[in-house]
């Protein structure tokens, strides 16, 4: 089931998927002056079995200078809405990402790929947020969002990250910084679609994330 909307935006923050759930689609977009090859795929699809997931189809771009046709626009699969885009920079990923069952890792770039990637997320997808450079987390509650299905409709959970540019915030004295505990959240406020194993693995990944994995920014 595709998610109807884009993941929520957080002021002065970017989000990133660490891995993509099976069923996720990535549009085959080419940079200006290039187009998809004639018989090329419209999108890549994350598919797999119980032990291994990978991207089906390959995106291929060719120079459009050889054709004197009108400007070609990449069609979207019929009933799908456009997903959030991401600027392609370094597709560096944490090594443990591949071990997440039922998920694909970030697809490697293809030749003459567009500068932005358009993903079509599915229910159960999780994305992680981080404050942009020059801002810091005033409050770091759950800094992720999950696409979940409620009452037959999809919705992304609201991340509880507040990024501030103000460096002079006051902290009350004599208080140790507590550890936020994601496992303490009531069921009604988490997605029933994300298994404990998924959540723990992804939380551990999020906890060990280095800034470098956020180099592929979502606009």
């Amino acid at each position: 089931e595709l998610c109807d909307d884009d993941p929520p935006e957080i002021p002065h923050a970017t989000f990133k998927a660490m891995a993509y759930k099976e069923g996720t689609m990535l549009n085959c977009e080419c940079k200006r002056g290039f187009r998809r090859i004639k018989s090329g795929s419209l999108y890549m699809l994350c598919t797999g079995n119980s032990s291994h997931s990978s991207w089906d189809n390959q995106c291929q771009c060719t120079s459009s200078a050889t054709r004197n046709t009108t400007k070609q626009v990449t069609p979207q699969p019929e009933e799908q809405k456009e997903r959030k885009t991401t600027e392609m920079q370094s597709p560096m990923q944490p090594v443990d990402q591949a071990s997440l069952p039922g998920h694909c890792r970030e697809p490697p770039p293809w030749e003459n790929e567009a500068t932005e990637r358009i993903y079509h997320f599915v229910v159960g997808q999780m994305v992680y947020y981080q404050c942009v450079q020059g801002y810091r987390a005033l409050h770091r509650g759950p800094a992720e969002s999950v696409c979940k299905m409620t009452h037959g409709k999809t919705r992304w959970t609201q991340p509880q990250l507040i990024c501030t540019g103000e460096m002079e915030t006051s902290q009350f004295p004599g208080e140790e910084k507590p550890q936020a505990s994601p496992e303490g959240r009531p069921e009604s406020e988490t997605s029933c679609l994300v298994t404990t194993t998924d959540f723990q693995i992804q939380t551990e990944m999020a906890a060990t994330m280095e800034t470098s994995i956020f180099t592929t920014e979502y606009q």
């Epitope: 409050h139 609201q158 910084k177 507590p178 303490g184």
Partner: antibody, heavy 115, light 107 residues
């Protein structure tokens, strides 16, 4: 279910200080920042500030800087707002509200400042 | 600070009417906008967040739209229980400011 329960009404004299509380239940307290908002009689809503229940960091609206102090006690899942040097213009209903989108609010604490 | 301006400041409408309240920000706030409903003597209640997402439990007759500086809250078919004052508020940056409110009365 999620609840924010605030302390009872207060009557104070000008120049005095005030401390009101907001106890959260039904969710993990440190997951959500806490905002304080006030509403003078017949007036609109005014944002006082926000505190991270996780770190204790706080940001105040300029108007309340130096006179308002927000704190939290994570052991009791309670947020506090202290307001010093009270004046009659501070007469208002004070609310706590949870999270980025203020999705749950306390019932309000009526504060009357009068000589 | 970002100023939020609501219009109208008050309006009277009949049950079944389509009602629209607008909110304008003094600068671009993307979609970082919430709408609240407040009834006399009660705390505000979240209706819409991130400009267009309906809060849980809010009837589908309420909808939000807009982005940048101009936003709209629409009640498609006014119900008697919809009376009260409606506020918009941004969460783009601190201080998070509210609109002055729109008082909605049922004719």
């Amino acid at each position: 279910q999620v609840q924010l329960v605030q302390s009872g009404a207060e009557v104070k004299k000008p120049g005095a200080s005030l401390k009101i509380s907001c106890k959260g239940s039904g969710y993990t307290f440190t997951d959500y920042a806490m905002h304080w908002v006030r509403q003078a009689p017949g007036q609109g809503l005014e944002w006082i500030g926000v505190i991270s229940t996780y770190s204790g960091d706080a940001i105040y609206a300029q108007k309340f800087q130096g006179r308002a102090t927000m704190t939290v006690d994570t052991s009791t899942s309670t947020a506090y707002l202290e307001l010093s040097s009270l004046r009659s213009e501070d007469t208002a209903v004070y609310y706590c509200a949870r999270g980025v989108t203020f999705d749950y609010w306390g019932q309000g604490t009526t504060v009357t400042v009068s000589s | 600070d970002i100023q939020m301006t609501q219009s109208p400041s008050s309006l009277s409408a009949s049950v079944g009417d389509r009602v629209t309240i607008t909110c304008r920000a003094s600068q671009d706030i993307s979609n970082y906008l919430e709408w609240y409903q407040q009834k006399p003597g009660k705390a505000p209640k979240l209706l819409v967040y991130n400009a267009k997402t309906l809060a849980e439990g809010v009837p589908s007759r309420f909808s939000g739209s807009g982005s940048g500086t101009d936003f709209t809250l629409t009640i498609s078919s006014l119900q008697p229980e919809d009376f009260g004052t409606y506020y918009c508020q941004h969460h783009y940056d601190t201080p998070y400011t509210f609109g002055q409110g729109t008082k909605l009365e049922i004719k």
